[in-house]
Interface confidence: medium
């Protein structure tokens, strides 16, 4: 994953999890915990910022509880003793649903954002610079824990109002139906569409169901290449497509195509032999003009995992790689609902596709 200028993320860590925060907590450090609340077992989970691995000294204990209508407990533990609880009688998490939890360390407090919305602030009871470990336990599955210190500014910063540097490799959970957000899109309503998550068996017992089709089973943790699938309902403003995979060590090129009949409405073509990310449209077997400009260095690296997030807007596609916005591609084929086929090919191994 392309997490520039910060500690490398912990990817898909097993729970319970404890990991070192390199350099400890610093003013301005943002830590993102991305995962899914388990729907079956347990009624609690916790994220702890602590000293060492014992759990006796926890500067900040963030503890959502699905009990008594749901609430979140914040507390501090010193020498094994808990202080007075601070309770927030609001539950921003839902069982079985993914979440993105972002902590901002500041001189006076921790600020906590859940799913892009500021949720709570917790004033320091002990000096935060003592913290060198983050731990997560309880009924939660983790996708990643990432770190970003704004003092090391990447060329193209991801964002600061929401959790950033996220690889967007969500656990493949059913999302159900969704609608466009109000106020943002043009007046014509987007269709209500089912998300389809194409899954593979990555480990015993880790198969998830999808709301629209049964899981696609393969004998090894990879998709067949080239991979072709239908985008139910085609594209429309607010439609998003997520792909994750790994670039082969000797990769030359790969492509992600969004197709409309015989046309390729959007051709995304990372080329390692040219150190470029080429975008184009093919209509009646004729290619248009290439777009190659990037706001930062080539985000795809041979031998490394990646995620690509394509968001359809009214005028363009927005593409993020490893959670950071990379470019916009203005629609050349404007009949969005007819763009209903995804094709992936080339020198990569796919691990997750969500259309």
């Amino acid at each position: 994953m392309a997490f520039s200028g910060s500690q490398a993320p912990y990817l898909s860590p097993a729970v319970p999890f404890s990991g070192t925060i390199q350099g400890g907590l610093q003013d301005g450090l943002q830590i993102t915990v991305n995962g899914t609340v388990l729907s079956s077992s347990g009624t609690r989970f916790a994220v702890n910022f602590q000293t060492g691995f014992s759990g006796n000294d926890i500067a900040f204990h963030f503890n959502p509880r699905f009990e008594d209508g749901g609430y979140v407990v914040c507390n501090t533990r010193q020498n094994g003793s808990w202080g007075p609880e601070e309770r927030k009688t609001h539950m921003p998490f839902q069982k079985g649903m993914p979440f993105d939890l972002c902590f901002l360390v500041q001189s006076s407090d921790f600020k906590v954002m859940v799913n892009g919305i500021l949720f709570v602030q917790y004033f320091h009871r002990v000096p935060f610079h003592r913290v060198d470990t983050i731990s997560v336990n309880g009924s939660v599955q983790l996708s990643y824990i990432s770190f970003q210190n704004p003092r090391t500014v990447p060329v193209q910063p991801a964002f600061s109002t929401v959790p950033f540097s996220q690889p967007v490799c969500f656990p493949p959970r059913p999302r159900g139906r969704r609608q466009k957000p109000p106020g943002v899109w043009p007046a014509n309503p987007a269709p209500i569409t089912q998300t389809v998550i194409h899954t593979v068996q990555s480990a015993p017992g880790q198969m998830f169901s999808t709301p629209a089709i049964p899981p696609m089973m393969y004998p090894h943790p990879a998709y067949p290449m080239p991979f072709i699938t239908t985008i139910l309902g085609g594209l429309y403003p607010s439609k998003s497509i997520l792909l994750s995979g790994t670039v082969l060590p000797s990769a030359q090129r790969f492509h992600i195509n969004l197709c409309s009949g015989n046309h390729i409405a959007f051709h995304l073509n990372p080329r390692f032999d040219e150190n470029a990310v080429v975008r184009n449209t093919q209509i009646d077997n004729s290619w248009g003009s290439e777009e190659r400009s990037l706001p930062r260095k080539m985000p795809f690296v041979r031998g490394q995992s990646f995620s690509v997030w394509i968001l359809c807007e009214a005028h363009c596609l927005k593409v993020a790689v490893d959670g950071q916005h990379l470019f916009e591609y203005y629609h050349r084929l404007r009949n969005l609902p007819t763009i209903n086929r995804l094709e992936v090919g080339g020198d990569i191994q796919l691990t997750h596709v969500q259309t």
Partner: antibody
Framework: EVQLVESGGGLVQPGGSLRLSCAAS????????IHWVRQAPGKGLEWVAS????????SYADSVKGRFTISADTSKNTAYLQMNSLRAEDTAVYYC??????????????????????WGQGTLVTVSS | DIQMTQSPSSLSASVGDRVTITCRAS??????VAWYQQKPGKAPKLLIY???SLYSGVPSRFSGSRSGTDFTLTISSLQPEDFATYYC?????????FGQGTKVEIK
């Protein structure tokens, strides 16, 4: 149709208090973020305070911190700005405004807009002796 | 706090001109940058959100872009109704800051 209507402005002496109201229609304040933005005569826009109603989180500009309080009454679908210890430099037109709706979680690389799509007509607050 | 330095503070242009207004953030910010148009005695109107997304109903002659900490509003062909004051705005962890404004006047 989304509408925001401010009220409660007027003339007040330095050190005095005022409570501004913002009646919302066409959406629910309980699921939106509400901002107060002010504009002194002939000057630019200045953010004052915000309430993230879904969580109750509030934030304030340094210039008003400790003097102003933002709140919302979901039963009345109304947001408020309680202004205490008013100063001459607080004289301005005060706008109540709604944040653009967030994308849900699945669009976060672009997800939190922090932009204001609907504004009230404004209410003038004059602090003068 | 993050400051947004907007330039120029004013400019004179003619109908049909291409106009560019820039805001520079004092530190790394997200793409949660918006642009507004305000006319005298009126509330501001949202033009661009998320740095480059055109808000519903806004003419396509308005566009936004970013390069690092620089954010740009471009009016490709100035129309009579575009003479107004323009503001950029960023949002970071619940704190909002506006640029000082750019007044676009008729040449």
């Amino acid at each position: 149709e989304v509408q925001l209507v401010e009220s409660g402005g007027g003339l007040v002496q330095p050190g005095g208090s005022l409570r501004l109201s913002c009646a919302a229609s066409g959406f629910t304040v309980s699921s939106s973020s509400i901002h107060w933005v002010r504009q002194a005569p002939g000057k630019g826009l200045e953010w004052v305070a915000s309430i993230y109603s879904s969580s109750g989180y509030t934030s304030y500009a340094d210039s008003v911190k400790g003097r102003f309080t933002i709140s919302a009454d979901t039963s009345k679908n109304t947001a408020y700005l309680q202004m205490n210890s008013l100063r001459a430099e607080d004289t301005a037109v005060y706008y109540c405004a709604r944040n653009v709706e967030n994308y849900p979680y699945w669009a976060w690389p672009w997800g939190y807009y922090g932009a204001i799509d609907y504004w009230g007509q404004g209410t003038l607050v004059t602090v003068s002796s | 706090d993050i400051q947004m330095t907007q330039s120029p503070s004013s400019l004179s242009a003619s109908v049909g001109d291409r106009v560019t207004i820039t805001c520079r953030a004092s530190q790394s910010v997200s793409s949660a940058v918006a642009w507004y148009q305000q006319k005298p005695g009126k509330a501001p109107k949202l033009l661009i959100y998320s740095a480059s997304s055109l808000y519903s109903g806004v003419p396509s002659r308005f566009s936004g872009s970013r390069s690092g900490t620089d954010f740009t509003l471009t009016i490709s062909s100035l129309q009579p109704e575009d003479f107004a004051t323009y503001y950029c705005q960023q949002s970071s962890w619940g704190l909002i800051t506006f640029g000082q404004g750019t007044k676009v006047e008729i040449k």
